[in-house]
Amino acid sequence: TPEVWVQVQMEATELSSFTVHCGFLGPGSISLVTVSWGGPDGAGGTKLAVLHPELGTRQWAPARQARWETQSSISLALEDSGASSPFANTTFCCKFASFPEGSWESCGSLPPSSDPGLSAPPTPVPILRAD
């Protein structure tokens, strides 16, 4: 069964900077990745980025840069320009659309006791939805 993993880390140098890493574990080719925050895509979350292997990428503030790390994983850099860090308690969700499997989505957040630069290991988290 395909799985999606989500990893959120705080940057050691910039406490207001975060990076979300997401990956798809399974066969098939990725046709689209959607990253959202505050909840799943289409279920109360706010779209942060979309990445397409041919059409390119788009991101929306506070996302700064979305990029492919491998053919089945992506990273998204975020910058919290506010005085506080709402990202610390925010859920980030990644949805991978693949052929022929369909769509798979999982969510993750910054571990509660994260030291800057540290993060939870990139283990698969429960799949919230498979379309």
Partner: antibody
Framework: QVQLQQSGPELVKPGTSVKISCKAS????????INWVKQRPGQGLEWIGW????????YYNEKFKGRATLTVDKSSSTAYMLLSSLTSEDSAVYFC????????????WGQGTTLTVSS | DIQMTQSPSSLSASLGGKVTITCKAS??????IAWFQHKPGKGPRLLIH???TLQSGIPSRFSGSGSGGDYSFSISNLEPEDIATYYC????????FGGGTTLEIK
Amino acid sequence: QVQLQQSGPELVKPGTSVKISCKASGYTFTDYYINWVKQRPGQGLEWIGWIFPGSGNTYYNEKFKGRATLTVDKSSSTAYMLLSSLTSEDSAVYFCARDGGLRGPFDYWGQGTTLTVSS
Amino acid sequence: DIQMTQSPSSLSASLGGKVTITCKASQDINKYIAWFQHKPGKGPRLLIHFTSTLQSGIPSRFSGSGSGGDYSFSISNLEPEDIATYYCLQYDYLYTFGGGTTLEIK
């Protein structure tokens, strides 16, 4: 087909507020950001802010923070912009525009709403 | 904030001719630039996004190029309906429009 239909022209007094609407049709309203853009007479375009209808999350140009409030009504696929404490500087044409994501920013626009602030 | 400096602010050209408009960003915008055509009484029309990608239905007379902080937009074989004001827009982070270029036909 995608359409953004804006409310009609407004003539209001200084110090009051006005709420402009933008009704979307032809696509899934909750999937795309709605932006608001200002154009003063004889001047260029200025981005006010965006709202993501799926969550109601907003982001504002610093210049308009506290003056503009963006909201949506998902049931009617309508976006709203409330402008408060109006002055003559707010007299302008206001546009709503959809951000098409990978299809490009501001790929569909409303026809514009003319706001005149005068005593 | 990212600033966009668009030039010229106005230009005049002959039918069948070619015009070029430039936009300079205050920092690298990673090719996230779009170009719009705006006619009085209407909403602007997206012509090009991601520097050079033509929107569906836009004739190939319109083109865009550039990288880093320097971008250009051209219209060749000018037609009467090209009379309009043209704007660039950076969308690398938030959105900033250029000041606009008013095109008139000689």
